[in-house]
Amino acid sequence: TQNKALPENVKYGIVLDAGSSHTSLYIYKWPAEKENDTGVVHQVEECRVKGPGISKFVQKVNEIGIYLTDCMERAREVIPRSQHQETPVYLGATAGMRLLRMESEELADRVLDVVERSLSNYPFDFQGARIITGQEEGAYGWITINYLLGKFSQKTRWFSIVPYETNNQETFGALDLGGASTQVTFVPQNQTIESPDNALQFRLYGKDYNVYTHSFLCYGKDQALWQKLAKDIQVASNEILRDPCFHPGYKKVVNVSDLYKTPCTKRFEMTLPFQQFEIQGIGNYQQCHQSILELFNTSYCPYSQCAFNGIFLPPLQGDFGAFSAFYFVMKFLNLTSEKVSQEKVTEMMKKFCAQPWEEIKTSYAGVKEKYLSEYCFSGTYILSLLLQGYHFTADSWEHIHFIGKIQGSDAGWTLGYMLNLTNMIPAEQPLSTPLSHSTYV
């Protein structure tokens, strides 16, 4: 064993997505000699870490090491041993940790410090754990889907590699929905981006892109639900909240302390004459939709056009990939088909929300009740956010493609993040060498 094992002609990378509700580990693989080619990196594994998001470990940081063990061990099994020491590991934390940092920078730092110490114990090339910004989350999601769709390739293909790929080089917009935030990112058509905070300039493969992005903190599906509950309990006459976003017959007790635990509900906080209240579902899509709309302040806009809460949004342009919870929720509701119109989606949501809870539980016996109970709210929220929040219309709805995977890789920010940190997206178009033609065969 006197010589370092010859490295394989493939490379690997690991990215952990530390989201608000859970952590997922992604393993990527690519041919070593084609690092600068577009579309060569693909996902070989996803491992969902058992348990909640890392922000929930604030009072039990000593458990973080055990929490990460199974997925890190899985990575050791999937990646050849000879590659371990050269495999970079990155952890990016998103809105759950952004919220924790808003509450206490010290607590957020403590969690990240333990995460870093745990990950550095593995025989990989650990490159750090950090809270990524909402702007990065949006940008990397946009890079991921366009990289996987082949939009950065200068070769115009006459064939389609994915069902919704058009032959033109026009990029897709990215719509990302998490538990604590949601991102919208796209290239506007000849439109000045009026707010500098929402403007990104990229030069990728020899082409310039002026990209609009915004991340709405507290408008992920879980935090939006907390917001809605905090808003609605203000006007409840007693400790019963009759909620149209839950199925008829559904009942759940909520602690007021849990409701006000998140910074997202601070604007609705008030002293209530009870410590707990009971949600009683009444299952009415229209009323649920109306309640959700009250979370979007559309009365104020200092720009030519806004999404909500005074945030600039240029006119929508082109096709959009909607992924993460946009996809998971719509997939569960069987509404991801390209053929389903917005009117049909609304109709189906009305029927779904009106179904009695007992009936729903029987129909979906294999689904955890906590998740099952929230699909009516989540589906309604997605419609409200896309239509009233981002101003999609019945006509432009057909430009939204609900995407789980592209070419076997999950749509999301992690691939874009790794491509950026490993310098695998060159600013200029790589020079074609005689040997590289095999790439296109």
Partner: antibody, heavy 121, light 107 residues
Framework: EVQLVESGGGLVKPGGSLRLSCAAS????????MNWVRQAPGKGLEWVGE??????????HYAESVKGRFTISRDDSKNTLYLQMNSLKTEDTAVYYC????????????WGQGTTVTVSS | EIVMTQSPATLSVSPGERVTLSCRAS??????LHWYQQKPGQSPRLLIY???QSISGIPARFSGSGSGTDFTLTISSVEPEDFAVYFC?????????FGGGTKLEIK
């Protein structure tokens, strides 16, 4: 020829300090994780700690028994590994070996000859 | 930490005999188990890595097996130069830990 040569051992009083060195030759030192392993007289082997590469920000890991007292460092330009030992205790008395793995990780296929550290009043 | 337990502590055998040394880990370490030989006054020498992988220059009479928590080092026919102390090592996770050793002595 691949070689590791330790130096710097000797007699030191409890509470004192000592710095061990390990000169590496015959391989590209900067590309390999390096370790210290010790062996108390008549006893078994005990891993002391490791240091990784510049690309790993020279990350270090230590055995619980030496954490906070011992520091491993490296100078890639001099092909040298160091072990700074502070607040020494009598139980730190041992032969200290500099080791590495030239293939894969966390086993040791190259060992130095060892240097003896005696902690006694 | 992973505790490595070797048995027996001492093994008396005659040259030419087949011997089996045992090593047990306190939790599963897959095949991340390595074996070393140490002679008096010398540095340890790697014999087997990853439970069963042989090293060039090490006689073929040395072989390793096992996975998970139980491992063995076998010397098919003991030679006089094999009388030494043998250590197993957890190479799975930090801290790296060694067994207490098995002393192989002449009967």
């Amino acid at each position: 020829e691949v070689q590791l040569v330790e130096s710097g051992g000797g007699l030191v009083k409890p509470g004192g300090s000592l710095r061990l060195s390990c000169a590496a030759s015959g391989f590209t030192f900067s590309k390999y994780w390096m370790n210290w392993v010790r062996q108390a007289p008549g006893k078994g082997l005990e891993w002391v700690g490791e240091i990784r590469l510049k690309s790993n920000k020279y990350g270090t890991h230590y055995a619980e028994s030496v954490k906070g007292r011992f520091t491993i460092s490296r100078d890639d330009s001099k092909n040298t590994l160091y072990l700074q030992m502070n607040s020494l205790k009598t139980e730190d008395t041992a032969v200290y070996y500099c080791t590495t793995q030239l293939d894969l990780y966390w086993f040791f296929d190259v060992w130095g000859q060892g240097t003896t550290v005696t902690v006694s009043s | 930490e992973i505790v490595m337990t070797q048995s027996p502590a001492t093994l008396s055998v005659s040259p030419g005999e087949r011997v089996t040394l045992s090593c047990r880990a306190s939790q599963s370490i897959s095949d991340y188990l390595h074996w070393y030989q140490q002679k008096p006054g010398q540095s340890p020498r790697l014999l087997i890595y990853y439970a069963s992988q042989s090293i060039s220059g090490i006689p073929a009479r040395f072989s390793g097996s096992g996975s998970g928590t139980d491992f063995t080092l076998t010397i098919s026919s003991v030679e006089p130069e094999d009388f030494a102390v043998y250590f197993c090592q957890n190479g799975h996770s930090l801290p790296l830990t060694f067994g207490g050793g098995t002393k192989l002595e002449i009967k």
